[in-house]
């Protein structure tokens, strides 16, 4: 499955829309920074199987999803940038659904190994739990937008690595 | 009864390597993450490395990265750590550990083996 | 890294004291810190999990509290088969980190 180029155009536009949705200075919270330690290793290897690799890359993408879909979430961001995120994750997660679908099936056999997904899947949570710690406060939501623009610019370079092996 | 027991400590030289092993009874092996946890005689606890359900997932503590590296095999459940470039620093028990969950961060070390131990010397 | 700290590092208490460990870490771990106890020539046990969870077969003497970066072991009557080192560690993320260990003997 070849991901389309449009695929890489949409993650671009939402690392833009993640940076202008910023609402006040990350210098402002460095009281409330916090190691979630997003999984690295999952995202460095060359070990993975193509179909590995976009598993966890729409795992993270539909994690992201999830994360700013909260009521919680409407009331901290810019509600037409929150809308403009909704549509550009929507369909990345339909491009990677599509190939999903092609590679991780093969003669009627699962070929994932779920380590990785699950890996993804406790970051996620780290975040969740730290702002339901943090009362969801402002702060919060700023540490969590600079860590989720972080960890979409790990799963470029995985992204990257998987268009070179097209 | 629930039983990890390690072997292939022992004496190596500095520069020098050894792989432990891990045979695991008692329990689903492939379900959880497995870890190795190092003490030096007299010291306290540093955890070496962390391997998930299915061996992918894997996490090494600074000091090792690079030096160690860890495996398992589901079918027969072993688990192993391989160590290259010895020093003298890496002379402790390692003690084999079961997690709570199937991979590593956001768990327990629930099960320890009775440890093996290396010593690094010339 | 988060940096487990645990105090004090050793203790002399008589049997049926009450008898409490703290243990602090360098950011929030919510509820993710594990205590260990481990007699002499002995691998480590687990003894409580998520700060609070006392494991099977664990006497009900032991306790947990805390959560985010302040957590204590609780013995609340200490018996002779007490006499252990015992470790705190954050199970949060990798790489795990334990506490220096504390000490309990038996006067």
């Known amino acids: 499955c070849d991901l389309p180029q449009t695929h890489s155009l949409g993650h671009r536009r939402t690392m833009m829309l993640l940076a202008q949705m910023r609402r006040i200075s990350l210098f402002s919270c460095l009281k409330d920074r916090h190691d979630f330690r997003f999984p690295q290793e999952e995202f460095d290897g060359n070990q993975f199987q193509k179909a590995e690799a976009i598993s966890v890359l729409h795992e993270v993408i539909q994690q992201t999803f999830n994360l700013f879909s909260t009521k919680d979430s409407s009331v901290a961001w810019d509600e037409r940038l929150l809308d403009k995120l909704y549509t550009e994750l929507y369909q990345q997660l339909n491009d990677l659904e599509a190939c999903v679908m092609q590679e991780v099936w093969v003669g009627g056999t699962p070929l994932m190994n779920e380590d990785s997904i699950l890996a993804v899947r406790k970051y996620f949570q780290r975040i969740t739990l730290y702002l339901t710690e943090k009362k969801y406060s402002p702060c919060a939501w700023e540490v969590v937008r600079a860590e989720i623009m972080r960890s979409f610019s790990s799963s470029r370079n995985l992204q990257e690595r998987l268009r070179r092996k097209e | 009864e629930m039983q990890l027991m390690e072997s292939g400590g022992g004496l190596v030289q500095p520069g020098g390597s050894l792989r432990l092993s891990c045979v695991a009874s008692?329990?689903?092996?492939?379900?959880?993450?497995m870890s190795w946890v190092r003490q030096a005689p007299g010291k306290g606890l540093e955890w070496v490395a962390s391997?998930?359900?299915?061996?992918?997932?894997?996490y090494y503590a600074p000091s090792v990265k690079g030096r160690f590296s860890i495996s398992r095999d589901n079918s027969n459940n072993t688990l192993y750590v391989q160590m290259n470039s010895l020093g003298v620093e890496d002379t402790a028990f390692y003690y084999c550990?079961?997690?709570?969950?199937?991979?590593?961060?956001?768990?327990?070390?629930?099960?320890w083996g009775q440890g093996t131990l290396v010593i690094v010397s010339t | 890294d988060i940096r487990v700290t645990q105090s004090p590092s050793s203790l002399s208490a008589s049997v049926g004291d009450r008898v409490s460990i703290s243990c602090q870490t360098s950011?929030?771990?919510?509820?993710?810190l594990n205590w260990y106890q481990q007699r002499p020539g002995k691998g480590p046990q687990l003894l409580i999990s998520a700060a609070s969870t006392l494991q099977s077969g664990v006497p009900s003497r032991f306790s947990g509290s805390g959560s985010g970066t302040d957590f204590i072991l609780t013995i609340i009557s200490l018996q002779p088969e007490d006499s252990a080192s015992y470790y705190c560690?954050?199970?949060?993320?990798?790489?795990?980190?334990f506490g220096q260990g504390t000490k309990v003997e038996i006067k």
């Open positions: 950011q929030s771990v919510n509820i993710y």
């Open positions: 560690q954050q199970g949060y993320i990798t790489p795990y980190t």
């Open positions: 391997v998930g359900s299915q061996g992918g997932s894997k």
């Open positions: 550990v079961k997690e709570t969950d199937a991979v590593a961060t956001m768990d327990a070390l629930d099960m």
């Open positions: 008692g329990f689903t092996f492939k379900s959880f993450a």
